[in-house]
C-alpha cells in the first residue's frame, strides 16, 4: 500500500513539475526591466526564451519574436535546448510511468516489469528536473553577467554615440516557476525510484525443478515422490530416480508428448 502511495504521489508531483516546466518555457517573463528614465513614456520591458515585449504606461504592449537564430546569444540557445530536452524527457517519463502504476492493470504485466518501468520513468524525471534547473540557472547567470558588463559604458560607432544604460534588472516570474517546477520533477523522480524498490519481487530461495517422463516404462525409486516436491533434503537437485528429474538447466531441447512441466 505504501509503495502504491509513493508511486502515485511521485507521478502526481512529477506531472505538476513537468506542467510547470512547460509553462516556464512558454512564459515571456524570464527577465524584466523598468525603463522609467524616459521623457516620452514609462517603459516596462520583459523578455522570454522566444520573444521580447515592451509595455508602456498607456497599457500598450508590443512583442517581437527572436526570428533569427544566428544573432541570438549561444547561452540563450543552450537554455532553450535544456528546457526542451527537459520537457521531452518528462513527457516520455510520464507516458512510461502511467503504464508502470501499480493501481493500473494492463494485461498480465508482471511486477518486475512495472518495477523496471517505474525506475526508468523515475530516472527520466530526475534528468528532466535537472535540465530545467540547469536551464533556468544558466539564464539567471546570464542576466547577472549582462548587468555587470553593461555598467554605463559609452562608445562611438558609425551611427553616432551609443550609451549602455545601467538598468535595474530583475529575475522574471518564469525563473521562479522553472526552479520550483524543476525541483518538483526531481522530487517526483526520486519518489518513483524509491517506489521501484518496493515493487521489485522478492527472489525465491530455491530452484524450480521440472520433471520429464523419458519413456512409457518408468521405474521410480523409493522416496522419489518426496524428493519431487523440490523441497526437503534434496537441496542440490540431484537425480533420485531414473524417470529423469532435471533441473531447468538440464532440460532436453526436443519436445515430447509425455512432457509434464
Amino acid at each position: 500500500m505504501a509503495v502504491t502511495a509513493c508511486q502515485g504521489l511521485g507521478f502526481v508531483v512529477s506531472l505538476i513539475g513537468i506542467a510547470g516546466i512547460i509553462a516556464a518555457t512558454c512564459m515571456d517573463q524570464w527577465s524584466t526591466q523598468d525603463l522609467y528614465n524616459n521623457p516620452v513614456t514609462a517603459v516596462f520591458n520583459y523578455q522570454g526564451l522566444w520573444r521580447s515585449c515592451v509595455r508602456e504606461s498607456s497599457g500598450f504592449t508590443e512583442c517581437r519574436g527572436y526570428f533569427t537564430l544566428l544573432g541570438l546569444p549561444a547561452m540563450l540557445q543552450a537554455v532553450r535546448a535544456l528546457m526542451i530536452v527537459g520537457i521531452v524527457l518528462g513527457a516520455i517519463g510520464l507516458l512510461v510511468s502511467i503504464f508502470a502504476l501499480k493501481c493500473i492493470r494492463i494485461g498480465s504485466m508482471e511486477d518486475s516489469a512495472k518495477a523496471n518501468m517505474t525506475l526508468t520513468s523515475g530516472i527520466m524525471f530526475i534528468v528532466s528536473g535537472l535540465c530545467a534547473i540547469a536551464g533556468v540557472s544558466v539564464f539567471a547567470n546570464m542576466l547577472v553577467t549582462n548587468f555587470w558588463m553593461s555598467t554605463a559604458n559609452m562608445y562611438t560607432g558609425m551611427g553616432g554615440m551609443v550609451q549602455t544604460v545601467q538598468t535595474r534588472y530583475t529575475f522574471g516570474a518564469a525563473l521562479f516557476v522553472g526552479w520550483v517546477a524543476g525541483g518538483l520533477t526531481l522530487i517526483g523522480g526520486v519518489m518513483m525510484c524509491i517506489a521501484c524498490r518496493g515493487l521489485a519481487p522478492e527472489e525465491t530461495n530455491y530452484k524450480a525443478v521440472s520433471y520429464h517422463a523419458s519413456g512409457h516404462s518408468v521405474a521410480y525409486k523409493p522416496g522419489g515422490f518426496k524428493a519431487s516436491t523440490g523441497f526437503g533434503s534434496n537441496t542440490k537437485n540431484k537425480k533420485i530416480y531414473d524417470g529423469g528429474a532435471r533441473t531447468e538447466d538440464e532440460v532436453q531441447s526436443y519436445p515430447s508428448k509425455h512432457d509434464y512441466v
Epitope: V43, E56, G160
Partner: nanobody, 120 residues
Framework: QVQLQESGGGLVQPGGSLRLSCAAS????????MGWYRQAPGKQRELVAG???????NYGDSVKGRFTISRDNAKNTVYLQMNSLKPEDTAVYYC??????????????WGQGTLVTVSE
C-alpha cells in the same frame, strides 16, 4: 551593433517646412522609444519630440503645434514633420532611440546629427 541613419536636414526659409527621418538598423529586439533632440550653438541639448511604439508622443514646449512626430514600427523609422519653421529652430537635430539590445540589457543610441538652418 545599432546604427542610425538620419536624413532630411538642410537650409529653409522662415515659415517653410522640412521632414527629417531616422532609420535604425542592426541586431536588436525592440525599440520602445524613438525621438528627436536638438542643440543650437552655445545651448544645451533639448527634447524636440519623442514617440513610443504604441504611439504615445511628447513634444518640447517650443515646438508644440508646429512639429509632428510619427514612426513606422515595421521599418524601425521615425519621422519629424517640421512646419512654420522659425530662425530659432536652427540647430543640429539628433535622432535618439532606446533599444532593447539583448537579454537583460538596453542601449540609448544617438545619431550623428543633421543640420537644420532657418534663414532668409
Amino acid at each position: 551593433q545599432v546604427q542610425l541613419q538620419e536624413s532630411g536636414g538642410g537650409l529653409v526659409q522662415p515659415g517653410g517646412s522640412l521632414r527629417l527621418s531616422c532609420a535604425a538598423s542592426g541586431t536588436f529586439f525592440n525599440i520602445p522609444v524613438m525621438g528627436w533632440y536638438r542643440q543650437a550653438p552655445g545651448k544645451q541639448r533639448e527634447l524636440v519630440a519623442g514617440i513610443s511604439t504604441g504611439g504615445t508622443t511628447n513634444y518640447g514646449d517650443s515646438v508644440k503645434g508646429r512639429f509632428t512626430i510619427s514612426r513606422d514600427n515595421a521599418k524601425n523609422t521615425v519621422y519629424l514633420q517640421m512646419n512654420s519653421l522659425k530662425p530659432e529652430d536652427t540647430a543640429v537635430y539628433y535622432c535618439n532611440v532606446l533599444v532593447i539590445s539583448g537579454i537583460g540589457s538596453h542601449l540609448e543610441v544617438w545619431g550623428q546629427g543633421t543640420l537644420v538652418t532657418v534663414s532668409e
